[in-house]
């Protein structure tokens, strides 16, 4: 899997997890956002080569086309599969909420 | 959506469905399909500026990191939502076999 | 019911100035990213300018050092200032509102034309 356990431990070009910490104020200008500051959103990049963690029927023939016809614009990309929830803290007026935010942590990725 | 009753008819730099015809023997090198001789693939590409067509929260999330931090490499990619199967008849040996194939035509695009 | 009403656009000649003003109801406004698209004959919407709930900003390349973006959150509005304007701003200007708690929303749209 192209996880924090693979893609952390390995320099890798090709389509991995890469590392995101997001701070809520500084990086997005939300200041809404009582609890946390910020949170490891984490991002998919990378090369998407032949037979790379492909995702589908589709990307495994995208992959083939794509290396057998290298000056095609078509092409698989590194997208993210798994995604964790985030809880948050902030206010309505002086009333405090607390409400998860569904997908937003990627744990891993794929070729799509 | 981003299909081809809207990719097909606008000029789109953004993330959209792009006509793609495979034939399977030319493009792939494969010899062993007998029908069809190639098929309309399709496949997802274009920029992901911020709020076009987001997938989940954390493509929302990053599609604003990057419209404030241009700079930086984190941005979402423009991949396939909605696939269809392709049905094929190919032989081993002399018998001949009729397969369902998943997942091998796109039919719309999200980034993600 | 969330509204966004744009106003402010019109007919200008070029190098002139508009300023455009969303006005929102129905939503926490101060927690709402606000942008403002806009959207020419043929051509695809495209992102003119943001500022987000904390004021952070950001503008199209086209615009830059012309075009500025604020809001006042006791007014629940947005605003777009266009100075130096250029035929290729002609195009109708949409206001969009969005929090990532809840889908976007986006207003009827100001029509802008720049013409001598």
């Known amino acids: 899997a192209l996880d924090a356990a693979y893609c952390f431990r390995n320099v890798q070009d090709n389509c991995c997890l890469r590392p995101l910490y997001i701070d809520f104020k500084r990086d997005l200008g939300w200041k809404w956002i009582h609890e946390p500051k910020g949170y490891n959103a984490n991002f998919c990049a990378g090369a998407c080569p032949y037979l790379w963690s492909s995702d589908t029927q589709h990307s495994r023939v995208l992959s083939l086309y794509n290396t057998i016809n290298p000056e095609a614009s078509a092409s698989p990309c590194c997208v993210s599969q798994d995604l964790e929830p985030l809880t948050i803290l902030y206010y309505i007026g002086k009333t405090p909420k607390i409400e998860q935010l569904s997908n937003m942590i990627v744990k891993s990725c794929k070729c799509s | 959506a981003l299909d081809a009753a809207y990719c097909f008819r606008n000029v789109q730099d953004n993330c959209c469905l792009r006509p793609l015809y495979i034939d399977f023997k030319r493009d792939l090198g494969w010899k062993w399909i007998h029908e069809p001789k190639g098929y309309n693939a399709n496949f997802c590409a274009g920029a992901c500026p911020y709020l076009w067509s987001s997938d989940t929260q954390h493509s929302r999330v990053l599609s604003l990191y990057n419209t404030i931090n241009p700079e930086a490499s984190a941005s979402p990619c423009c991949v396939s939502q909605d696939l269809e199967p392709l049905t094929i008849l190919y032989y081993i040996g002399k018998t001949p076999k009729i397969e369902q194939l998943s997942n091998m035509i796109v039919k719309s695009c999200k980034c993600s | 019911q969330v509204q966004l009403v744009e106003s402010g656009g019109g007919l200008v000649q070029p190098g002139g100035s508009l300023r455009l003003s969303c006005a929102a109801s129905?939503?926490?406004?101060?927690?709402?990213?606000m942008a403002w698209f806009r959207q020419a004959p043929e051509k695809q919407r495209e992102l003119v300018a943001l500022?987000?709930?904390?004021?952070?900003?950001a503008y199209a390349d086209s615009v830059k050092g012309r075009f500025a973006i604020s809001r006042d959150n006791a007014k629940n509005t947005v605003y777009l200032q266009m100075n130096s304007l250029k035929a290729g701003d002609t195009a109708v200007y949409y206001c969009?509102?969005?929090?990532?708690?809840?889908?976007?929303?986006w207003g009827q749209g100001t029509q802008v034309t720049v013409s001598s």
């Open positions: 129905g939503i926490t406004f101060s927690h709402y990213d």
């Open positions: 969009n509102a969005h929090w990532v708690l809840t889908s976007q929303y």
């Open positions: 500022i987000t709930s904390g004021g952070k900003t």
